[in-house]
């Protein structure tokens, strides 16, 4: 009689994570008497996957009833496959022995490859806000995919970005992989409504890539522009001065009025108006009683935006002249009107 052969007909099997893998094995003879066992890997460190008579293998079931007379089918199913299950599986026939059964013949092995989807990409931006014209970095991470081949793209408002670096780890063989990418984005004043998108394409996604997004509203700070104007006189001894705070983001803003360097009033931006580009405008006004001043008055609008150093704009109010209609921003009225930082 011909010597027993162990046949594993499939050189390789490809299974999606979460599914069941079927590993086929048949023997050509019932002799010698002894069990079949399944291992992952070869050599002394191989892992026992299934032993018919003894052991706890909750994910493994046999395809046929091994106790049936003349059974020579030793195929198994492994449920709920994960990337960690990848490897080469051997069906091994043992001969009865004492104290241990003796390995008699092994199948050629079946390589189990696992396809696993990447996790949803997570995009994170810089810890601190940055202003327009600055370059900021965004990172994108996705984990747990297999095989290693993967494509990652960056977009800003639908336009593909080119300034990015991507790494897939580990470099060598692994049960699953991770991808990490860093993209550089130049901010503009119009970016409050902008989005940065990281797109990951993988064979397991069947042409439907995964996307992670970051809103630039979380990253950008648009500093305000200030304009101080003097309105027509309401009454003979009162002048209305306004401070227009324009195009700022985020909303967090505190404004202080100074009369000749002395704090007159402090207020926090509340009822702001929103521009189409997502930035905000706000206006504060100060009613100055001219009769209370003998000399000219220097009015300063000082703005602290989003915890940044204050910026200010000043307006010189001439007490001597009381024109009925005082225009705005004339040289006489606005001598010190350049923006400056107050530390």
């Amino acid at each position: 009689e011909e010597e027993l052969q162990v046949i594993q007909p499939d050189k390789s099997v490809l299974v999606a994570a979460g599914e069941t893998a079927t590993l086929r094995c048949t023997a050509t003879s019932l002799i010698p008497v002894g069990p079949i066992q399944w291992f992952r890997g070869a050599g002394p460190g191989r892992e026992l996957i299934y032993n018919q008579k003894e052991g706890h293998f909750p994910r493994v079931t046999t395809v046929s009833d091994l106790t049936k007379r003349n059974n020579m089918d030793f195929s198994i199913r492994i449920g709920n496959i994960t990337p960690a299950d990848a490897g080469t599986y051997y069906c091994v026939k043992f001969r009865k022995g004492s104290p241990d059964d003796v390995e008699f013949k092994s199948g050629a092995g079946t390589e189990l490859s696992v396809r696993a989807k990447p996790s949803a990409p997570v995009v994170s931006g810089p810890a601190a806000r940055a202003t327009p014209q600055h370059t900021v970095s965004f990172t994108c991470e996705s984990h747990g995919f297999s095989p290693r081949d993967i494509t990652l793209k960056w977009f800003k408002n639908g336009n593909e970005l080119s300034d990015f670096q991507t790494n897939v780890d580990p470099v060598g063989e692994s049960v699953s992989y991770s991808i990490h990418s860093t993209a550089k984005v130049v901010l503009t004043r119009e970016d409050v409504h902008s989005q940065v998108i990281c797109e990951v394409a993988h064979v397991t996604l069947q042409g439907d890539p995964l996307r992670g997004t970051a809103n630039l509203s979380e990253t950008i700070r648009v500093p305000p522009t200030l304009e101080v104007t003097q309105q027509p006189v309401r009454a003979e001894n009162q002048v209305n001065v306004t401070c227009q705070v324009r195009k700022f983001y985020p909303q967090r803003l505190q404004l202080t009025w100074l009369e000749n360097g002395n704090v007159s009033r402090t207020e926090t931006a509340s009822t702001v108006t929103e521009n189409k580009d997502g930035t905000y405008n706000w206006m504060s006004w100060l009613l100055v009683n001219v009769s209370a001043h003998r000399d000219d008055v220097k009015l300063t609008c000082q703005v602290e935006h989003d915890g940044q150093p204050a910026v200010s704009k000043s307006h010189d109010l001439k007490v001597s002249a009381h024109p009925k209609e005082q225009g705005s921003n004339t040289a006489a009225e606005n001598t010190g009107s350049n923006e400056r930082n107050i530390y």
Partner: antibody, heavy 114, light 110 residues
Amino acid sequence: EVQLQQSGAELVKPGASVKVSCTGSGFNFKDMYLHWVKQRPEQGLEWIGRIDPENDSTKYDPKFQDKATLTADTASNTAYLQISSLTSEDTAVYYCARGNYVHWGQGTLVTVSA
Amino acid sequence: DIVLTQSPASLAVSLGQRATISCRASESVQYYGTSLMQWYQQKPGQPPKLLIYAASNVGSGVPARFSGSGSGTDFSLNIHPVEEDDIAMYFCQQTRRVWTFGGGTKLEIK
């Protein structure tokens, strides 16, 4: 549902024999070894031996070789443990257990007393 | 036979703390790359319940606070955080050659 149902408690005299049964349901009775374990009051667990119901092959701990006999009847899905020449040292709870470590019978208390 | 020496024989742990039980085998319980070592919990009047199989795999329905580690001859069972329901006897078992059990550890609450 997988179950191993053991026979009830036994009170036996010294020198006599006792036969404890273990009936399986919810699984293929022949597909795994069936083991027997002894636990004396307030003591640890001692392995007695195991039987392969598929072919009746047995293996014993040398300590129980002349004390215990394991048999199986696949028609009734039942395994048996027979203990002979009983002494007070044999007073214990006897468990049957499948080779997958998970499924154990509820235990049978055998009390040896004159 | 492979002899299993379990320690300590008894252990008193405060609720929420970690309990560690050790089991040393007189020879390796490795079967190729797999450690054939199990851990059981037994409560009075009940059969043993499988907690850990093949040294580090947690049994079905067993809470994640139970974990096993080790290979070759030295193994341990960890319970963290210990709960009131964990008061029981704990046994290690090797199945490399027939079956043998450790002497048991009685877990109590301080």
